[in-house]
């Protein structure tokens, strides 16, 4: 009855600091309310990056000031994290919780290592 969550092992952020990955879960029950949370793990410290709750069949909505956006389709969530810099390189864990109806189920992915490389500043051009 454990819920399994799959996510890619490694993702490289774009030069604009955007990283996208898919978080897929195998649901042990018929949930109508699902909560998706992205956690960042660094030096055994875990912090919450963003979270969203959605009703099955509806769109995933993060808070307006969130650095995350996403879309959902069945048991699959497409997550995008924006505004990343080199210092944000780390392990990003997808956590899925089936909130309603009871019982509650938890699923934690193994994490996606996101590598962020700050773009080189453009050299001054003399024309």
């Amino acid at each position: 009855k454990a819920m399994h969550v799959a996510q890619p092992a490694v993702v490289l952020a774009s030069s604009r600091g955007i990283a996208s990955f898919v978080c897929e879960y195998a649901s042990p029950g018929k949930a109508t309310e699902v909560r998706v949370t992205v956690l960042r793990q660094a030096d055994s410290q875990v912090t919450e990056v963003c979270a969203a709750t959605y009703m099955m069949g509806n769109e995933l909505t993060f808070l307006d000031d969130s650095i995350c956006t996403g879309t959902s389709s069945g048991n699959q969530v497409n997550l995008t994290i924006q505004g990343l810099r080199a210092m944000d390189t780390g392990l990003y864990i997808c956590k899925v919780e089936l909130m309603y109806p009871p019982p509650y189920y938890l699923g934690i992915g193994n994490g996606t290592q996101i590598y962020v490389i700050d773009p080189e500043p453009c050299p001054d051009s003399d024309f």
Epitope: K1, A2, L39, E48, P102, L106
Partner: antibody, heavy 120, light 108 residues
């Protein structure tokens, strides 16, 4: 440092009510799910209830469902457990515990507990 | 509801010895969702291990956890005087969150 201090325990007659409080400090209370866990004298641990960090979801053990209500006041950094229709088998030390960021069901910090005795 | 059983009920050992505590689940628990707690008389429990094998902050490395599926183990490599206590396993993968009945580690 994280601190959780329970209060409100005491001796109460069967069928009566009691409200427990848990005062939190040392962390951002509104960011964490919170639990009540109890331990009958000389017995093991039993999870009682959880409330999500934003109060949106609450779950209860079958043994207390319909009788106990968990709630929180984030402005006061306080967790509550309203216990109605108390029974002798509710006699226990009641602990409040913080759920971790990684998983709400991991109890990473505990209070020292408050004793509730249900007896006529 | 996932029922957890622990064995042995009591473990009598001497300081310096190795302690091996077992926790068995009535149905499969992903290894990510099992925790161990230590409780001393008159005190609140303390988190030792989560995710079956990850040590909580400040827990000495003589404590280690292992296992998967339905069988989990807490090992204390060399017992220190302060390790004599009751140990509980707990699953947090689904509600209701459940504890095992505990194993008491006492001094031989």
């Amino acid at each position: 440092q994280v601190q959780l201090v329970e209060s409100g325990g005491g001796v109460v007659q069967p069928g009566r009510s009691l409200r427990l409080s848990c005062a939190a400090s040392g962390f951002t209370f509104s960011s964490y799910g919170m639990h009540w866990v109890r331990q009958a004298p000389g017995k093991g641990l039993e999870w009682v209830a959880v409330i999500w960090y934003d109060g949106s979801n609450k779950y209860y053990a079958d043994s207390v469902k319909g009788r106990f209500t968990i709630s929180r006041d984030d402005s006061r950094y306080t967790l509550y457990l309203q216990m109605n229709s108390l029974r002798a088998e509710d006699t226990a030390v009641y602990y409040c515990a913080r759920g971790s960021i990684l998983a709400a069901g991991i109890f990473d910090y505990w209070g020292q507990g408050t004793l509730v005795t249900v007896s006529s | 509801e996932i029922v957890l059983t622990q064995s042995p009920g009591t473990l009598s050992l001497s300081p310096g010895e190795r302690a091996t505590l077992s926790c068995r689940a009535s149905q499969s628990v992903s290894s990510s969702y099992l925790a161990w707690y230590q409780q001393k008389p008159g005190q609140a429990p303390r988190l030792l291990i989560y995710g079956a094998s990850s040590r909580a902050t400040g827990i000495p490395d003589r404590f280690s956890g292992s296992g998967s599926g339905t069988d989990f183990t807490l090992t204390i490599s060399r017992l220190e005087p302060e390790d004599f206590a009751v140990y509980y396993c707990q699953q947090y993968g689904s509600s209701p969150f459940t504890f095992g009945p505990g194993t008491k580690v006492d001094i031989k």
